[in-house]
């Protein structure tokens, strides 16, 4: 998979969206690689 | 409100050395990769390099590499582009941006900066 | 380094026309792909990411498509403050490339 900081971000972003946001507050992109996903 | 706010226009002469600042509001500046982009007269964006704020990481254009340094100072919220040796073909508007997911989700641009290489 | 190419380079289209822009990638980047516009003296406008995805407050006019190596930007029914210069990004692969952009004219 895509593991450029802008494919992190994105995919957090989505991971995020299906959550509802109930995600621990230090998952943000600059704390997570691709292999969080 | 997601700002990034950049520092003013340049003139430098071939050779010498320029610090661009971009200057985040609105968010956790931590959070979220910086981009540094450039733009020459009528030419295609160019992509210089990201920072992660957060632990001051960084990926390069092989282009730049050597010659670009990005930092971070994490107290003020604010980014730094440094640009070495400069040429006449590095006359260009350079940008910061980011992409943040709160509080809105978009991929936030600076205003520009102008930085013109003449001697 | 992963070459963008953007066709065409410019278009003269009128208002209410439906216009097409296409991004081609010299090699595969999945949907890894955005959009941006910009106006003479702006910044760039972020339209698209993930190749067909609208960023909040985009117009629905906006619509892109594509995945591997062909990718496209479709305006449904140009409005006047579509005229501008449109540019695809690659973000799969660093350095992350931009194509050359096309200017959509007046016709």
């Known amino acids: 998979a895509c593991d450029t900081a802008t494919c992190v971000t994105h995919r957090l972003a989505g991971l995020l969206s299906r959550s509802g946001g109930v995600v621990k507050n230090n998952f943000v992109p600059t704390n997570v690689g691709s292999k969080a996903f | 409100e997601v700002q990034l706010v950049q520092s003013g226009a340049e003139v430098k002469k071939p050779g010498a050395s320029v610090k661009v600042s971009c200057k985040a509001s609105g968010y956790t500046f931590t959070d979220y990769y910086m981009n540094w982009v450039r733009q020459a007269p009528g030419q295609r964006l160019e992509w210089i390099g990201d920072?992660?704020?957060?632990?001051?990481?960084?990926n390069y254009n092989q282009k730049f590499k050597g010659r670009a340094t990005l930092t971070v100072d994490k107290s003020a919220s604010t980014a730094y582009m440094e640009l070495s040796s400069l040429r006449s073909e590095d006359t260009a508007v350079y940008y910061c941006a980011s992409i943040i997911i709160v509080p809105n989700y978009f991929d936030y641009w600076g205003q520009g900066t102008t930085v013109t290489v003449s001697s | 380094d992963i070459q963008m190419t953007q066709s065409p380079s410019s278009l003269s289209a009128s208002v209410g026309d439906r216009v097409t822009i296409t991004c081609k990638a010299s090699?595969?980047?999945?949907?890894?792909v955005a959009w941006f516009q910009q106006k003479p003296g702006k910044s760039p406008k972020a339209l698209i990411y993930s190749a067909s995805y609208r960023y909040s407050g985009v117009p629905s006019r906006f619509s892109g498509s594509g995945s591997g190596t062909d990718f496209t930007l479709t305006i449904s029914s140009l409005q006047p403050e579509d005229f501008a210069t449109y540019y695809c990004q690659q973000y799969n692969n660093y350095p992350y490339t931009f194509g050359g952009g096309t200017k959509v004219e007046i016709k």
């Open positions: 090699q595969n980047v999945d949907t890894n």
């Open positions: 920072i992660n704020p957060n632990n001051v990481g960084t």
